[in-house]
């Protein structure tokens, strides 16, 4: 089983999200995204910015779902 990383904040997660950012990331700064492993204690969508930063976000936030739809369409 995959172990959760020791990353405790919303930034630079290596495996799982323990907390989520409270800020909406501007869409133009986002390059890609991935969903955290289903074995993590909390679900998470990790957005990768153009500067290479990874940010944990809450899938239940509307802007997160909107961004995912936009990136899938494009």
């Amino acid at each position: 089983t995959k172990t959760e990383s020791s990353s405790r904040g919303p930034y630079h997660p290596s495996e799982c999200c323990f907390t989520y950012t409270t800020y909406k990331i501007p869409r133009q700064r986002i390059m890609d995204y991935y969903e955290t492993n289903s074995q993590c204690s909390k679900p998470g969508i990790v957005f990768i910015t153009k500067r290479g930063h990874s940010v944990c976000t809450n899938p239940s936030d509307k802007w997160v779902q909107d961004y995912i739809k936009d990136m899938k369409e494009n």
Epitope: Y20, T22, N58, S60, K62, W63, Q65, K72
Partner: antibody
């Protein structure tokens, strides 16, 4: 008129599998999320999981190992399946719509009346 | 997980009076807090989200305030129909609910 309605619950035995269906009317499953929440007798509300407008399902940590949420957009239904029932799963189960107008799909504006599920041998 | 602790039940006040219900989060949840009203045998009804924004159709007698870890729901000009259990919900992190606070209108 927008509404959601849960299917009938009933009496289950320990180790049984629960299947509940939420039927939505007056709105599309593509326009919001459906949450499942339960409430044990005399207790507070407990989140189980939800399915997004694009069909991705997410679960509370306690529920994810034995819960599955799916949807049928043709029939406007969302199904909750929960395996390995125990007496602790005795509760009223609600489905509720989150339209995202609050900025978050966990905030739910339309609730079903709920259906009672009793687990007993 | 975030734990929400609410004012102990019951809280009582006369018709026309004011009640205040507190909800304390175990860690900061910014303003990601909602309040629901629930009457026996009925589903919850959304009152407030974003800690202070009234949901559609909710009278202005209901007022939410707070941010971070301390939140308050104030009901003024109490009516008999306000007798119910009120629950807070955090939607920043884990989607947890408080245990509920029963309001009795005398």
């Amino acid at each position: 008129c927008q509404s959601v309605k849960e299917s009938e619950g009933g009496l289950f035995k320990p180790t049984d599998t629960l299947t509940l269906t939420c039927t939505v009317s007056g709105f599309s499953l593509y326009s919001g999320a459906i949450n499942w929440v339960r409430q044990a007798p005399g207790e507070g509300l407990q989140y189980i999981g939800w399915i997004s407008d694009v069909g991705s399902a997410y679960y509370a940590s306690w529920a994810k190992s034995r819960s599955t949420i799916t949807r049928n957009t043709n029939e406007n239904t969302v199904t909750l399946k929960m395996t390995s029932l125990t007496a602790a799963d005795t509760a009223t189960y609600f489905c509720a719509r989150g339209d995202g107008s609050s900025g978050n799909y966990w905030v739910t504006d339309i609730w079903g009346q709920g259906t009672l599920v009793t687990v007993s041998s | 997980a975030v734990v929400l602790t609410q004012t102990a039940s019951p809280v009582s006040a006369p018709v026309g009076g004011t009640v205040t219900i507190n909800c304390q989060a175990s860690e900061s949840i910014s303003s990601r807090l909602a309040w629901y009203q629930q009457k026996p045998g009925q589903p919850p009804k959304l009152l407030i989200y974003g800690a202070s924004t009234l949901a559609s159709g909710v009278p202005s007698r209901f007022k939410g305030s707070g941010s971070g870890t301390e939140f308050t729901l104030t009901i003024s000009d109490l009516e008999c129909a306000d007798a119910a259990t009120y629950s807070c919900q955090e939607y920043l992190s884990d989607n947890t609910f408080g245990g509920g606070t029963e309001v009795v209108v005398k």
